[in-house]
């Protein structure tokens, strides 16, 4: 395929894999997709750190990358014909796996507008610098490449795979080797969390001799949201080592019998779970792990807990604290939306008032309604506004254009309207003549 899986990091409910290989963005996405994932999202600082960790793992194994400034594709792309939107954090780009626009971004430099071709984003790694959590890889935007021509400095890509849940790694109570095979076809002996539907092959023994036993387990859902291997007791136990090897594979306490056998135990306030290895708090909520108004909710068997937020709030990335939901992101209002702690309120533009079908709707204010008109004479209601008009012989006046002022027809822009004398009246005028002259039937001339 032109790409090698070199590194994997699993955390929360997702795994990230880093691959080296000079592939175009489309080829990289296809590679991730074939195994059930997508090019990685980087939707938060925390996720950026996970991606950085998997890239650091890759770089430790990769002898020498050709470019000092190396680029690795992530799943942020902008289709041809879709223009840059500088007001948005993602600048009009979107995640290949779908999902909402996210507030986090880490652009390398100001983006140039170009709608004529598809654009793709890669993470820019300066290999002359150590990868530090405080210095997260910057986002670099450029052409997406084509087969055989991935683009300058493209050295690989990062995939993301999401799962229902994860199992804890298997604990060995004696010499042996665990090999995990994940659903995305990666094998590893060291995962801090093992994704649902992964297989674990355990070969017990010192390695130089023939293995004495081997075991096979699958990470499965044992009960709603409870993911476990279904193994009971420590694996690869050896009377030779007792509790001295990896604490007997026990989560907390290990107790040796005189015959070389041993049992796992738990500290006060904890209890041993069905796997006879792991300890869980008798009541995980008793330590008040949830913050910021979050309520602690016990999971099945009292094994775990989740924090639940009041309405209008959601859990932050730590899953322990509540943060306000910005309901305005979903555009619930017809016109203006104001986010408030725990909720939101809709407001209407000037010239509109709340009302009409649907929540948050606005309807036009009829400024010309009886007893409400701001106009001195005529009033015409318009959508969101109004305009005043004046009867013949009057013109709009006043700063706000609501008053009517008599037109002095005697000094009209077309010159004098009367041949001789002109008398202005409210809203009109009439002509007159000097003594000895008579106003003609046309009301203008004097004869």
């Amino acid at each position: 395929t032109g790409a090698d899986t070199e590194a994997v990091v699993c955390v929360g409910t997702a795994c990230y894999t880093a691959h080296s290989g000079k592939l175009s963005a489309a080829e990289a996405q296809n590679h991730c997709n074939q195994n059930g994932g997508n090019l990685a999202t980087v939707k938060s600082k925390e996720e950026a750190q996970h991606v950085q960790r998997v890239l650091a793992q890759l770089l430790r194994r990769e002898a020498a990358l050709t470019a000092r400034m190396s680029k690795f594709w992530i799943g942020l792309q902008r289709e041809k014909g879709k223009c840059l939107d500088p007001s948005l954090p993602l600048k009009g780009f979107s995640w290949v796996g779908g999902g909402e626009d996210t507030p986090y971004s880490n652009w390398h430099k100001e983006l140039r507008n170009s709608c004529i071709s598809k654009r793709c984003v890669s993470l820019l790694l300066d290999l002359s610098q150590p990868l530090l959590p405080s210095r997260l890889p910057k986002w670099s935007e450029g052409p997406c490449g084509s087969p055989g021509s991935p683009g300058s400095n493209i050295e690989g890509f990062v995939c993301k795979f999401s799962f229902k849940g994860m199992c804890r790694p298997l604990a060995l109570g004696g010499p042996g080797q665990v090999t995990y095979t994940t659903p995305f076809q990666t094998t590893s002996s060291s995962l801090e969390a093992v994704p649902f539907a992964s297989a674990a092959n355990v070969a017990c023994g010192e390695g130089d001799k023939d293995e004495t036993q081997s075991h096979y387990f699958l990470c499965k859902e044992k009960a709603p949201d409870v993911f476990d291997w279904g193994s009971s007791g420590p694996l690869c136990v050896s009377p030779k080592y007792g509790c001295n090897f990896n604490n007997g594979g026990c989560h907390q306490d290990c107790f040796e019998g005189g015959d070389g056998s041993f049992l796992c135990g738990c500290r006060p306030g904890f209890r041993l779970l069905d796997d006879l290895v792991t300890c869980a708090s008798r009541n995980p909520c008793s330590s008040s792990p949830c913050r910021g108004g979050a309520t602690c909710v016990l999971g099945p068997h009292g094994k775990n807990y989740t924090c639940r937020c009041p309405q209008g709030y959601q859990l932050d990335s730590s899953q322990l604290d509540c943060v306000d939901v910005d309901e305005c992101q979903d555009s619930p209002c017809a016109q203006e939306c104001v986010n408030t702690p725990g909720g939101f309120r809709c407001e209407c533009w000037v010239g509109y008032e709340p009302g009409g079908p649907g929540e948050g709707a606005c309807q036009d204010v009829d400024e010309c309604a009886l007893g409400r008109s701001p106009c001195a004479q005529g009033c015409t209601n318009t959508d969101g506004s109004f305009h005043c008009s004046c009867e013949e012989g009057y013109v709009l006046a006043g700063e706000d254009g609501t008053q009517c002022q008599d037109v002095d027809e005697c000094v009209g822009p077309g010159g004098p309207l009367c041949d001789s004398l002109c008398f202005n009246t409210q809203g009109s005028f009439h002509c007159g003549c000097l003594p000895g002259w008579v106003l003609a039937p046309n009301g203008v001339s004097c004869t």
């Epitope: 297989a199 096979y216 044992k222 009960a223 709603p224 949201d225 016990l298 999971g299 099945p300 989740t306």
Partner: antibody
Framework: QVQLVQSGAEVKKPGSSVKVSCKAS????????LNWVRQAPGQGLEWFGR????????DYNGKFKGRVTLTADKSTSTAYMELSSLRSEDTAVYFC???????????WGQGTTVTVSS | DIVMTQTPLSLPVTPGEPASISCRFS???????????LYWYLQKPGQSPQLLIY???NLASGVPDRFSGSGSGTDFTLKISRVEAEDVGVYYC?????????FGGGTKLEIK
Amino acid sequence: QVQLVQSGAEVKKPGSSVKVSCKASGYAFSSYWLNWVRQAPGQGLEWFGRIYPGDGDTDYNGKFKGRVTLTADKSTSTAYMELSSLRSEDTAVYFCVRGDGYWAMDYWGQGTTVTVSS
Amino acid sequence: DIVMTQTPLSLPVTPGEPASISCRFSQSLLHSNGITYLYWYLQKPGQSPQLLIYTMSNLASGVPDRFSGSGSGTDFTLKISRVEAEDVGVYYCAQNLELPWTFGGGTKLEIK
């Protein structure tokens, strides 16, 4: 389509053992829990165990632990339920049932009648 | 073990009339993930049980929409809007939140 076909009726003496089979077809046998449920004559339903054929992981109702053994043969997509030390109160219809992703028991075998009588 | 009480034991209904069966559990079946792991099964005379409703309110494939499920964390109801002759049998509620999975005692629906 998903099918679970169970072995035929059995008549057993108290103290003996019985082994009921359940052949699955129409789905990925290794990837779903297979439950065993029994129903005594004129009584309700009672869950007594399950197996995950993918790796042979089992869970038992504590009431039957030690007397029941569940096994599965992936090569033939067949699950087995063996109940030992039979007593007259084990007389019942035994069902094998697939568990789906929502934990529902969505497909049931036709049932196997086990009669324990001296 | 989670214990459940199903009522009534027997339910005679006239065809075309509605019917309602209740099930009460000794603890909440609402998981912290927001899903309620409550199920309803029907065992028609001489047949294996069949799934009617999963996770409290979702209709299983092929089940007529005259059946509906509702409830809170511990109290649940199965409703049949208009009973038909083919609906006779024993209805069971069940929980799959915690091992061992448990069933209610059953409600026998018969036609008047």
